[in-house]
């Protein structure tokens, strides 16, 4: 609460996160023209990336384009991309939606459709829907440990959210354990009124707000964090503004002296840890 | 404008960026002693990296050192690095400018020059100028979509820069479309009074400032962002303080059971999105 | 100092860091059943990662699990993980400490011990201590150049920590050169009252605070940074809360058409650059 006689100072914060959990993923795998069910295990090194402290990412879904090579090929026949003659294809043109640079030729994509030929990583990425349900939907049961060190330099005061008395096998709960800093991802979503299973398909951004309202006067000292959660991406966003949260990255390799890559379109939850608050002292 | 009767609160912000664009790169490629012109396509997975929300990087230039192996070799004969006898080479010495640890021997680098032998990734990186013009100079035409969610917790008010009424095919313009949040990289530079083609060679840091000056009183409510742009790195910086913006990263692989790497010195623009402002309410 | 007649404004900051240094690492390497001493050189591309401006990471130690494949194998016999019959193993169970999903079978781990079989990246990671002394303990002699651009938009004032008069071969010293922005990592630790050699084993988080107390009135203008250092992770942290600083990442490759990975558990120092302060003007 506001104490007008106090000198207020904003918090200086550092965050460290640690995600735990394993996901079993079942998907169709095609090898040598034969499609069969494949099972694989994803651990932290597979589904998360070494990001900075105040943000961490958990991959919940993906689409792979394997064995791409830099060459010429027909572009993917998305809406409005088909052609019937070379006139429709403009040499040197880069359609922002396309994945390559047009050569000016209209070529067969398959039996029935023709598209403009492009110089690109081929075959170009198919614009297919993210798998539903999400491949790593079990990430709902992953946990994240959040360590937060705060400082009020003007008051020469430092503290952290984890106290020596805390129990490392706790799980945060708004009522039963509001000071525990180990959070189940599914619980974070529930607290924010969101459905993890749904968001996991396209990805999203979730805010974990840590509010420090610190009274640093010795006679009524109080300085503990309050956690709250809210979704940061717009779930009602128009298609043209790229709903959800995804990014593409590539694994490069050489095969028979040919430079190739596997392109991964990774959908997932980016968790932003937003630390704010003030320290007040007479 | 300052309303002294209002309670002011700083903004809590989360940012999400999405870069679009393809670059065609033409460079000399040497294979089996033969040098020829090579053309390649770079898409987002090739020129950008999954970074946090408030920063994104676009590679505009690079220098590659291919097929490096951990072994002994003569160091690169940069200014002041040549030797004429072993006396000039100190076993175990690591010159901060060098790329390895000296063995104490002075060995031939080429027909005319001798340098200290080092234990390093060999052959050591040549200290050659960044290509001019920049290899991905066409990145000037890439676009970035910036999504910004803001929150004034004390006023329990949340909003975002993208409104449902907005058009996903717009491009930001200071006069004609100042609320559009899709920015052409070249336009950002032009607004900041900088030359993209020039900065692309050595790299640089560009600030995109988003200023929220929010009046949250119901009778005169206003809360929309104002965008401005300024260069953050020092273009007049002395050579010793590393002008521009670059970093090195490596791609590791095995060839005939020998651990090798390709070292990439990536030059580019780091865009920092700096969100600030206040929300005021009676 | 507080000048009550001034209008104060918080700093808007952008940071760029550049680490320099080479480490020679000596470790036991096992090949074809024979263990011998291996020497290798680590440069910036090997021990650091392209992170954002306000944070950088230097790897000081590591544990490798090479040639992992997705298959079935006995889990690592850590404390409490051994079994004597299948009853102790629960099909589909994922122990948060384990690295896989139990099949329900109790199988031999070695001559004397049995553990639950798991579907995982195999062989599973051994829970061995981080090497002591740290493999890259010589990182103590690495240096980091910190470039900091600051802005007070309300006062339309911009400056940076590096002035044209500065010497690029300086090293920060609290007394002799407090404005030099090139820092030896070991010195940072010494200033913070910490032992680099010790922290390098398990990793840690170190704060570099840059304080700008700017008087922007023309008659008594002053705006230069003050650097201070403090450890941000809790060195007395309970084992259950993951002391130190480490993360796992993987290098994926194919061998004889089998997808494999090398898992690296990287320990190191994350340096957080915390910029704060105000600009005051009448």
């Amino acid at each position: 609460s506001d104490k007008l006689y106090q000198r207020k100072e904003p918090v200086i914060s550092s965050v460290h996160t640690k995600v735990k959990g394993i996901a079993e993923v079942t998907e169709n795998v095609t090898e040598g023209g034969v499609t069969k069910l494949g099972h694989s295990i994803f651990d932290t090194a597979d589904y998360t990336f070494p990001l900075q402290g105040n943000s961490f990412f958990v991959m919940t879904n993906y689409v792979k384009s394997e064995g791409q090579v830099q060459t010429l090929c027909p572009e993917y026949p998305r809406r409005g991309a088909q052609c019937s003659s070379d006139r429709r294809c403009k040499k040197g043109w880069m359609d922002p939606q396309s994945k390559g640079i047009q050569t000016g030729r209209c070529v067969p994509y398959d039996k029935t459709r023709k598209t403009c030929e492009v110089s690109a990583w081929c075959p170009t990425e198919e614009e297919k829907e993210a798998p539903r349900p999400a491949l790593l939907r079990s990430a709902e049961n992953f946990t994240v440990l959040i360590k937060n060190n705060i400082h009020f330099p003007g008051h020469n005061y430092t503290t952290r959210n984890i106290l020596p008395t805390m129990n490392g096998s706790c799980t945060f709960h708004k009522t039963w354990d509001p000071q525990c800093s180990i959070f189940r991802l599914g619980d974070i979503f529930q607290e924010a009124g969101e459905n993890f299973t749904e968001v996991a398909v396209q990805g999203g951004i979730m805010g974990i707000e840590i509010y420090w309202d610190c009274n640093l006067d010795s006679w009524s000292h109080h300085c503990r964090p309050r956690y709250s959660f809210r979704r940061l991406d717009d779930k009602n966003m128009d298609e043209s503004f790229v709903p959800g949260y995804n990014f593409r990255y590539a694994k490069y390799y050489k095969e028979n002296n040919v430079e190739k890559r596997t392109l991964i379109k990774a959908f997932g939850i980016r968790f932003d840890i937003l630390v704010f608050g003030t320290g007040g002292k007479f | 404008s300052d309303k002294l009767y209002q309670r002011k609160e700083p903004v809590i912000s989360s940012v999400h960026t999405k870069v679009k664009g393809i670059a065609e790169v033409t460079e000399n490629v040497t294979e089996g002693g033969v040098t020829k012109l090579g053309h390649s396509i770079f898409d987002t997975a090739d020129y950008t990296f999954p970074l946090q929300g408030n920063s994104f990087f676009v590679m505009t230039n690079y220098v590659k050192s291919e097929g490096q192996v951990q072994t002994l070799c003569p160091e690169y004969p940069r200014r002041g690095a040549q030797c004429s006898s072993d006396r000039r080479c100190k076993k175990g010495w690591m010159d901060p400018q060098s790329k390895g640890i000296q063995t104490g021997r002075c060995v031939p680098y080429d027909k005319t020059r001798k340098t200290c032998e080092v234990s390093a990734w060999c052959p050591t990186e040549e200290e050659k100028e960044a290509p001019r013009p920049a290899l991905l100079r066409s990145a000037e035409n890439f676009t970035v979509l910036i999504k910004n969610n803001i929150h004034f917790p004390g006023h329990n008010y949340t909003t975002r820069n993208i409104l449902p009424t907005m058009n996903g095919s717009c491009t930001f313009h200071k006069t004609w479309d100042p609320q559009c949040s899709i920015f052409r990289l070249g336009d950002i530079f032009q607004e900041a009074g900088e030359n993209f083609t020039e900065v692309a060679v050595q790299g640089g840091i560009m600030g995109i400032e988003i200023y929220w000056d929010c009046n949250l009183d119901s009778w005169s409510h206003h809360c929309r962002p104002r965008y401005s742009f300024r260069r953050l790195d020092d273009k007049n910086m002395d050579e010793s303080f590393v002008p521009g913006y670059n970093f090195r990263y490596a791609k590791y692989y095995k060839e005939n059971n020998v651990e090798k790497r390709t070292l990439i010195k990536a030059f580019g623009i780091r865009f920092d999105i700096l969100v600030f402002g206040t929300g005021g309410k009676f | 100092s507080d000048k009550l007649y001034q209008r104060k404004e918080p700093v808007i900051s952008s940071v760029h860091t550049k680490v320099k240094g080479i480490a020679e690492v000596t470790e036991n390497v096992t090949e074809g059943g024979v263990t011998k001493l291996g020497h290798s050189i680590f440069d910036t591309a090997d021990y650091t990662f392209p992170l954002q401006g306000n944070s950088f990471f230097v790897m000081t130690n590591y544990v490798k699990s090479e040639g992992q494949v997705q298959t079935l194998c006995p889990e690592y016999p850590r404390r409490g993980a051994q079994c004597s019959s299948d009853r102790r193993c629960k099909k589909g169970w994922m122990d948060p400490q384990s690295k896989g999903i139990q099949t329900g079978r109790c199988v031999p781990y070695d001559k004397t011990r049995k553990t639950c079989e798991v579907s995982a990246w195999c062989p599973t990671e051994e829970e061995k201590e981080a090497p002591r002394p740290a493999l890259l303990r010589s990182a103590e002699n690495f240096t980091v150049l910190i470039k900091n651009n600051i802005h007070f938009p309300g006062h339309n004032y911009t400056t940076r920590n590096i002035l044209p008069t500065m010497n690029g071969s300086c090293t920060f010293h609290k007394t002799w050169d407090p404005q030099c922005s090139i820092f030896r990592l070991g010195d940072i630790f010494q200033e913070a009252g910490e032992n680099f050699t010790e922290v390098a084993v398990q990793g840690g988080i170190m704060g570099i605070e840059i304080y700008w107390d700017c008087n922007l009135d023309s008659w008594s203008h002053h705006c230069r940074p003050r650097y201070s250092f403090r450890r941000l992770d809790d060195k007395n942290m309970d084992e259950s809360f993951v002391p130190g600083y480490n993360f796992r990442y993987a290098k994926y490759y194919k061998e004889n058409n089998v997808e494999k990975r090398t898992l690296i558990k990287a320990f190191g120092i994350r340096f957080d650059i915390l910029v704060f302060g105000t600009g005051g003007k009448f």
């Epitope: 010429l72 090929c73 030729r105 | - | -």
Partner: nanobody, 115 residues
């Protein structure tokens, strides 16, 4: 699924020539040839994009083999000259989405080069 029928295989002396042909049941962006020698894996030989652009050859056949195609007829042929005993294999016609990527294969035709 695309149907592919190869023809033109046979026995030939080292240094001789042979022409393989392949007809596809429908038009396709790229057509190419692979081969498999006894006890070895199937390997790429030559490929051609639409209208013969681009073409790609394995290093071992460069300068000796020439691929050509007729889009109108959905056919591809492989002119092989300067044949060597190590060219002995079953040759397969294939179609795909680029000169590096093939999805459909023919039944194959035997080529034997005697020394």
């Amino acid at each position: 699924e695309v149907q592919l029928v190869e023809s033109g295989g046979g026995l030939v002396q080292a240094g001789g020539s042979l022409r393989l042909s392949c007809a596809a049941s429908e038009r396709t962006y790229s057509m190419g040839w692979f081969r498999q020698a006894p006890g070895k894996e199937r390997e790429f030989v030559a490929g051609s994009g639409w209208d013969g652009i681009p073409t790609r050859y394995a290093d071992s056949v460069k300068g000796r083999f020439t691929i050509s195609r007729d889009n109108a007829k959905s056919t591809v042929s492989l002119q092989m000259s300067g044949l060597k005993p190590e060219d002995t294999a079953i040759y397969y016609c294939a179609t795909g989405t680029s000169v590096y990527h093939y999805q459909y294969w023919g039944q194959g035709t035997q080529v034997t080069v005697s020394s």
